[in-house]
């Protein structure tokens, strides 16, 4: 997701098919306020960014609204009137879905079903990760809708759960971003807990003398 051009590193993120964020690391332009100009149709005039991201008092990015029918972003980053980087990109490649909303859990014997509100667009995977204090790594399960059942749980154990949304590679390509994780929720015997004990780390083997 990083494009290079004349010492400029670019990162694009398309948040939930709603907002595009383009950020840059302008190593060759210290203390310069680079300007960002963009359009979603080749035939339009460029608009200048109205919501800049600032870093140490200087521009380092732009946030712009997009609509689901907008698919190509044409943009130019300029130092004064001089374009230092110009590109056009399919913005779907840089999709970052929003985190799961309205997450709820239902327990039935040795299984738990996590549900949340599905996002309004297709080509997504809803991933649930879970672990008990006996697990050193998160276990994972994912589905095409936000209705994910994890089976073969031990009701006596405390489990931590978290969820996120990922864009399917077959729909958006391999260079998208997963959503941020939802808050970790802990459950034991079908009830919420403030926390679970930390996972046990296996003891280090003693070296024989």
């Amino acid at each position: 997701q990083v494009a290079t051009g004349e010492g400029l590193q670019i990162q694009i993120m398309y948040f939930n098919l709603e907002t595009v964020q383009v950020t840059w690391n302008a190593s060759h332009y210290p203390r310069s306020n680079l300007s960002f100009h963009y359009k979603f149709s080749r035939d339009e005039a460029y608009d200048q960014c109205t919501v800049y991201i600032l870093q140490e008092g200087h521009t380092s990015g732009c946030l712009l609204d997009a609509e689901q029918q907008d698919d190509i972003l044409y943009f130019s980053i300029r130092n004064g009137t001089h374009p230092v980087f110009t590109a056009s990109r399919w913005i779907f490649y840089y999709l970052k879905p929003s985190s799961p909303k309205q997450v709820s859990f239902s327990w039935h014997q040795d299984a738990v079903t996590l549900t949340c509100s599905d996002l309004s667009y297709r080509g997504l995977l809803y991933e649930v990760q879970y672990r008990s204090p006996f697990d050193t790594e998160w276990q994972s399960k994912q589905e095409n809708t936000c209705n994910v059942t994890v089976e073969d749980l031990d009701a006596e154990k405390c489990y931590a759960f978290r969820a996120r949304v990922k864009a399917m590679e077959d729909a958006y390509g391999p260079d998208t971003y997963p959503s941020d994780w939802s808050e970790v929720t802990c459950w034991q015997r079908g009830e919420t807990r403030d926390s679970c004990p930390e996972p046990r780390t296996p003891p280090k083997p003693k070296l024989s003398k």
């Epitope: 494009a3 290079t4 990109r89 490649y93």
Partner: antibody, heavy 122, light 107 residues
Framework: QVQLQESGPGLVKPSQTLSLTCTVS??????????WSWIRQHPGKGLEWIGY???????YYSPSLKSRVTISRDTSKNQFSLKLSSVTAADTAVYYC??????????????WGQGTLVTVSS | DIQMTQSPSSLSASVGDRVTITCRAS??????LHWYQHRPGETPKLLIK???RSISGVPSRFSGSGSGTDFTLTISSLQPEDFATYYC?????????FGQGTKLEIK
């Protein structure tokens, strides 16, 4: 299995309009997500993308050819067509039709026609 | 437009050789780089998608790697039917653009 076949005149006079049709068999051009392209190859040169038409009729054209290109479709015949106006000798090329592998996001071209040579000459 | 530069532009090799073709993008394209084989008189054929993902029906001797701006197509052991022209193509930039091609000939 999808098959694509280009057809149209092999010789076009300068300043006229080049017209080609791609007939698709074994797959509907209205299948959700898929995009259909024209790509050309000048003699002894590399490949140049001309434009797409989508399952939803949306079109995208190469910026360098946009003013002269029209891509349309006839769903009843499962065909899509290319029109390139005001041709010159520089438009002499083998013209291919192709399908985009990942529907909505228009990535790789996974199925191609055999190609048809179009010569622009008076 | 994103420029795609392939090297070498032509290459002579023998059956059984290991061959590497490189493709460089003028801007970073992540892993959205695809490789094609074009034999004379045939339709171009997709070999590798997204830099390294294999395509059903394509022999395993074809592999790809790379990300960002530098990519490689490797043929582990050349077969007689592999003598052809190979093209790379980027897809995140608009318009899609191809490399100029690498012609693989019999030594």
């Amino acid at each position: 299995q999808v098959q694509l076949q280009e057809s149209g005149p092999g010789l076009v006079k300068p300043s006229q309009t080049l017209s080609l049709t791609c007939t698709v068999s074994g797959f509907s051009i209205t299948t959700s997500g898929y995009y259909w392209s024209w790509i050309r190859q000048h003699p002894g040169k590399g490949l140049e993308w001309i434009g797409y038409i989508g399952y939803n009729s949306k079109t995208y054209y190469s910026p360098s050819l946009k003013s002269r290109v029209t891509i349309s479709r006839d769903t009843s015949k499962n065909q899509f067509s290319l029109k390139l106006s005001s041709v010159t000798a520089a438009d002499t090329a083998v013209y291919y039709c192709a399908r985009s592998l990942y529907g909505g996001y228009k990535d790789a071209f996974d199925s191609w026609g055999q190609g048809t040579l179009v010569t622009v000459s008076s | 437009d994103i420029q795609m530069t392939q090297s070498p532009s032509s290459l002579s090799a023998s059956v059984g050789d290991r061959v590497t073709i490189t493709c460089r993008a003028s801007q970073s394209i992540g892993t959205s780089l695809h490789w094609y084989q074009h034999r004379p008189g045939e339709t171009p054929k997709l070999l590798i998608k997204f830099a390294s993902r294999s395509i059903s029906g394509v022999p395993s001797r074809f592999s790809g790697s790379g990300s960002g701006t530098d990519f490689t197509l490797t043929i582990s052991s050349l077969q007689p039917e592999d003598f052809a022209t190979y093209y790379c193509q980027q897809s995140p930039g608009f318009p899609p653009t191809f490399g100029q091609g690498t012609k693989l000939e019999i030594k």
